[in-house]
């Protein structure tokens, strides 16, 4: 039957929709089995994967999807909504111990680094030669940023500057890398995230580095100290163009909602952080940039700055996109989308 909605995460969706949210027709599952096995850990029930219907064979948190046969968009989600009255499946299972955000093996930190002043993962996204947004280098060819940073569909309008401290690149000539943008991959519906693919991989050196992603579905303790970085609006008349940092601390979603006078109900896909210093926080030009937290001496991007409800309003904590909620999607894109070789 032509089911028009799905329950939970759509793992059992058996409808006959065969078109993606981008308007592409789905390709036959049997043509893509090799790719599925190579890239995606999944629990195969071959009988479900008939024809080219939208399905969710890998338990994707964001619903049914399909392959497209289009090399630009190898797979995409389908335009099916959750059934009315059905609640979003929680990613945090309260029956189990809280998942740590840092990647650890038997309590030991993997790739942990001491806190340092290096912010080599910070990207300045340029639109028509001017800084428009921040971003985080999470892999040599991938920058995590926000969809509000892209007023044009012409990728020639953008470039990514890496290895800089000054928004104009003054004094950063030796360390600056300027890279073209080859693709924008928009996040799941309502996420406000974009994975921006670079035309060639960044060269990792003393000035350019990647930042870690948190574990999927992890929670970070309240009052954890974090930072936001950006070249955005500072309120200063003689802004020097240098990268700014604001120190924030993690606040639970309920408490955060109270600070917003109950006008805001936070979703599981959001994370909240309040300012240590009254009136500091992200603003225009900082969008797309990271909320960076440290756990077990490991720095991670836990949030992405998106346009919100005013800039740095006293006693109003900032609301960010919770990266841990989208970590599986990020990994799936990085695994399945082709990147240029260096």
């Amino acid at each position: 039957s032509g089911q028009d909605c799905y329950r939970g995460n759509g793992k059992n969706y058996m409808g006959q929709l065969s078109q993606t949210r981008s308007g592409l027709t789905c390709s036959m599952w049997d043509k893509n089995m090799e790719d599925l096995h190579r890239h995606i850990f999944w629990e195969p029930d071959a009988s479900k994967l008939n024809e080219n219907y939208c399905r969710n064979p890998d338990d994707d948190a964001h619903g049914p999807w399909c392959y497209t046969g289009n090399p630009l968009i190898p797979w995409d989600y389908c335009p099916i909504s959750r059934c009315e009255g059905d609640t979003t499946p929680g990613i945090v299972n309260l029956d189990h111990p809280v998942i740590s955000c840092a990647k650890t093996i038997e309590g030991r930190v993997v790739n942990g680094i001491p806190t340092r002043t290096n912010i080599g993962w910070m990207v300045s996204l340029r639109y028509r030669n001017k800084h428009i947004c921040g971003g985080s280098l999470i892999k040599e060819s991938w920058v995590l940023t926000a969809r509000q940073c892209f007023p044009s569909r012409d990728l020639k309008d953008y470039e990514a500057w890496l290895g800089i401290h000054d928004v104009h690149g003054r004094g950063d000539e030796k360390c600056k890398q300027v890279l073209q943008v080859s693709q924008l991959v928009y996040g799941p519906e309502g996420s406000d995230l974009v994975l921006m693919k670079l035309a060639r991989p960044a060269v990792l050196d003393d000035f350019v580095s990647t930042i870690d992603l948190p574990n999927y579905g992890c929670t970070i303790p309240e009052k954890t100290s974090c930072s936001v970085y950006g070249w955005g609006y500072t309120g200063l008349i003689n802004y020097d163009g240098l990268l700014r940092v604001a120190h924030l601390y993690i606040m639970g979603n309920e408490k955060c909602s109270q600070h917003h006078r109950g006008k805001v109900t936070l979703q599981e896909s959001e994370i909240c952080a309040g300012a240590e210093k009254i009136g500091s926080g992200p603003c225009e030009g900082d969008y797309g940039g990271p909320l960076v937290c440290e756990q077990h001496k490991m720095r991670m991007v836990l949030g992405v700055i998106v346009p919100g409800r005013g800039c740095a309003i006293p006693n109003r904590p900032g609301i960010f996109v919770r990266v841990a909620y989208y970590a599986k999607w990020i990994h799936k894109i990085i695994l399945t989308y082709k990147v240029p070789q260096s």
Epitope: L17, Q19, R21, S22, G23, L24, T68, N70, L72, I73, P79, Y127, R128, K130, I132, R147, Q148, F150, P151, S152, R153, Q183, L184, Y186, V194, E284, Y287, P307
Partner: antibody
């Protein structure tokens, strides 16, 4: 989701100019395109052009170049459209419309429309 | 400019019937990024148009599931599975793949 409040109806003489306004609320004004659409009585919709308030970028339909000028004031979250050298052909309802950025690029918030009547 | 041809111009239906509106573009609406920016709007008498379907087949929030969109390339269809009184008005298809953006001439859905 946002709202757009347009200025009131205008009655103008041929050859004159008119400037209509559109005040945005409930969303980040500088992070969406503002479009303008014309509708003549009983007729279809015609796209005039758009402005990106964050940067002041504009795109125009060739047919309206020289006729319409789009501006935006970020501080008051208001977009403006000036129509010049008016003729009876310019009598229409003009809508301001928010265009959601990618991956959507659709018109999701429409103003109520401003009626411009050109008569001698 | 991309010409959007909508048929029929007028569509008389009985309540509860299925309605189907066709929209054809003079060139492909597939953008170089792989997306197809073909949308459908409904304008009720005396009101502004409202978004129904975006990018061929995505229902906008709050739009009932009796509305569905399909198609690809240059040929697109809007279907209403069971017409209700509140569905009456003028339906426009629109493309935002190519500048200038263009609209179809509209299809008036009315009671038979």
């Amino acid at each position: 989701q946002g709202q757009l409040q347009q200025s009131g109806p205008e009655l103008v003489k041929p050859g004159a100019s008119v400037k209509i306004s559109c005040k945005a609320s409930g969303y980040v004004f500088s992070s969406s395109w503002m479009n303008w659409v014309k509708q003549r009585p009983g007729k279809g919709l015609e796209w005039i052009g758009r402005i990106y308030p964050g940067y002041g970028d504009t795109n125009y339909n060739g047919k309206f170049k020289g006729k319409a000028t789009l501006t935006a004031d970020k501080s008051s979250s208001t977009a403006y459209m000036q129509l010049s050298s008016l003729t009876s052909e310019d009598s229409a309802v003009y809508f301001c419309v928010r265009e959601e950025l990618g991956p959507y690029w659709y018109f999701d918030v429409w103003g109520a429309g401003t009626t411009v009547t050109v008569c001698s | 400019d991309v010409v959007m041809t909508q048929t029929p111009l007028s569509l008389p239906v009985s309540l509860g019937d299925q309605a189907s509106i066709s929209c054809r573009s003079s060139q492909s609406l597939v953008h170089s990024n792989g997306n197809t920016y073909l949308h459908w709007y409904l304008q009720k008498p005396g009101q502004s148009p409202k978004l129904l379907i975006y990018k061929v087949s995505n229902r906008f929030s709050g739009v009932p599931d009796r509305f569905s969109g399909s198609g690809s390339g240059t040929d697109f269809t809007l279907k209403i599975s069971r017409v209700e009184a509140e569905d009456l008005g003028v339906y426009f298809c629109s493309q935002s793949t190519h500048v200038p953006y263009t609209f179809g001439s509209g299809t008036k859905l009315e009671i038979k």
